[in-house]
């Protein structure tokens, strides 16, 4: 493309109207950047029709009509087949409906990378206010049957953000439902193919899959899942030169072991961790001792990423960053960052110590005007020790902020009310 | 600031016709459903119609059924009502709403009462 950014196309299939515009994930920037070809593209159409793929069409007008592209009764249409266009797809509402029906009866209709596309799409759409953000989490239903790993792939890392947005919060119950509802099924299809996790599954897609089905499972509380990463753990500790965990597997369930467990499941990660040989195995384990869920055996990490004895100075950021990401983890960190502020600069600052990557992990999950208060006033009171490379974060940052609390606004009754309605 | 400003009434004879709009500011009109409901003098407000986010879902009162039409423009950020064959009874206060909670408009059908987001009236009197 030689302009900047792609488009979004918009289908009303009550017309065979195709329109395009410039994509905006903020729909209230203004693009100030002007372009000699005004933001339309030629855009390479391909599309089904009831599963049955349709001639090639290329858009190359801001508006045109095709038959191609109009339906009538149940009948639905979806484009860019195969995402091979580098282009987003909106519809009309009617059809939107008719492809989650379509998901929820017959999902192998639509290719896989459609599917998750169609997920993938929807979210981003609603962060523009195309669609409403019901519509996105109604694309999700189907999940309940999908056992591929990209349409999965796709709903977690676009959920990611409403995790951020909402574990500490009411909506995360009904949201932790919803989703133990809908992975279930894959969690039981992986414990059945792979004969109780004893084999891995041969397809690599596949193996993602299943470490994506552990992960998920586990996290939102499927109790068999919680036993079985236990048991593996256990089985470790009881013979610890045999690790009987596949290493497709260890990350995650190192993790959702060390957070099940307590002080004993940590202590033996730590000293698995100290004698590791292979830094690949070390990296893994020192993730996931920052997934407990005890405060102070996170408090003791924390103390543990600024003696260079215990982690390494090049490790020190990505420890830290491991322990923010954990939502128990998230607000000892930044306190910590807050009251070591000046200590931190002087000792790291001249190091591989990520200023930058700190700032944006500990404050991700701030939404509220109270969190914006506590970061202008970090800002102000560090202003002469200086942000060095985490200058820029600082602002992005205090933006993002601003953008999450508008975003929560916006959308935590209406999700809270959705996940409610669909974890029964 | 969600505001809504319904517009479009006035005296019309039994049989005629009137168009309402409403015109919605403040928040992103094409991912909320829209309705309207009416208020006779004494009795309460009651459902009249509402329309999904994209339009293609219309629910109606038994009253404004085969009668009265709704549709939306959002591109103008506006949601009409056009009442047909009007009678006295028709006469009120009529009022416009949005629902986010249920952009498929059910959320009117559910609980009228319940909605947050209100307009200001415009009345309609059906008088000969």
């Known amino acids: 493309t030689l302009q900047m950014g792609f488009p979004v196309i918009t289908v009303d299939t009550s017309t065979g109207t195709l329109s395009q515009e410039h994509f905006l994930l903020d729909p209230d920037s203004n693009v100030t950047r002007p372009s000699e070809f005004n933001y339309v593209w030629i855009v390479p159409i391909t599309s089904i029709r009831d599963g049955r793929q349709q001639q090639d069409y290329w858009l190359i007008d801001v508006r045109a009509q095709n038959d191609l592209f109009s339906t009538s009764g149940n009948e639905w249409v979806l484009l860019n087949l195969n995402v091979t266009g580098y282009y987003r797809v909106n519809y009309d509402e009617e059809n939107w409906r008719k492809i989650q029906t379509q998901l929820q009866r017959d999902h192998s209709a639509i290719p896989v990378i459609n599917r998750a596309q169609i997920i993938n799409d929807a979210f981003n759409l609603a962060s523009a206010h195309k669609v409403p953000v019901t519509l996105a989490l109604n694309n999700t239903l189907f999940l309940i049957e999908e056992r591929q790993y990209m349409p999965w792939e796709a709903a977690l890392s676009s959920l990611s953000y409403f995790k951020l947005m909402f574990d500490r919060s009411e909506v995360y119950g009904p949201m932790k439902n919803y989703l133990k509802k809908q992975v279930t099924p894959l969690f039981i299809h992986f414990r059945n193919n792979t004969n109780n996790w004893r084999e891995i599954p041969e397809n690599l897609m596949d193996q993602y899959s299943e470490v994506n089905a552990i992960s998920t499972a586990c996290s939102n509380g499927v109790p068999e899942c919680e036993e079985m990463v236990s048991g593996l753990f256990k089985q470790w500790m009881e013979n610890p030169n045999n690790n009987p965990i596949h290493p497709n597997l260890r990350s995650t369930v190192y993790c959702n072991a060390i957070a099940q467990g307590g002080e004993e499941e940590w202590d033996f990660a730590w000293e698995q961790f100290r004698n590791a040989t292979l830094v690949n195995e070390a990296d893994k384990l020192r993730a996931a001792l920052a997934c407990s869920k005890e405060l102070w055996i996170l408090n003791r990490y924390l103390s543990y990423t600024l003696n260079p004895d215990l982690i390494r100075k090049q490790d020190a950021t990505s420890t830290i960053i491991s322990i923010t990401n954990n939502v128990i983890g998230q607000g000892l960190v930044w306190d910590f960052v807050q009251s070591n502020w000046k200590k931190l600069f002087n000792d790291y600052g001249g190091g591989s110590f990520s200023f930058s990557n700190l700032i944006q992990a500990v404050t991700r999950r701030f939404s509220t005007e109270y969190e914006l208060q506590q970061l202008e006033q970090f800002k102000k009171d560090n202003e002469e020790t200086g942000f060095g490379s985490g200058t820029r974060a600082l602002e992005q940052a205090l933006e993002k902020t601003k953008a999450n609390i508008k975003w929560v606004k916006e959308n935590k009754e209406v999700v809270l009310q959705w996940f409610t309605e669909n974890s029964k | 600031q969600v505001q809504l400003q319904a517009s479009g009434g006035g005296l019309v004879q039994p049989g005629g016709s009137l168009r309402l709009s409403c015109a919605g500011s403040g928040f992103t009109f094409s991912t909320y459903a829209m309705g309207w409901f009416r208020q006779a003098p004494g009795k309460e407000r009651e459902f009249v119609a509402a329309i999904s986010w994209g339009g293609s879902g219309t629910y109606y009162s038994d009253s404004a059924k085969g009668r009265f039409t709704i549709s939306r423009d959002n591109a103008k950020n506006t949601v009409y009502l056009q009442m047909n064959s009007l009678k006295p009874e028709d006469t009120a206060v009529y009022y416009c709403?949005?629902?986010?909670?249920?952009?498929?408009?059910?959320?009117?059908?559910?609980?009228?009462?319940?909605?947050?987001?209100w307009g200001q009236g415009t009345q309609v009197t059906v008088s000969s």
């Open positions: 709403a949005a629902d986010k909670l249920r952009p498929n408009g059910t959320g009117f059908l559910a609980r009228g009462t319940m909605i947050e987001t």
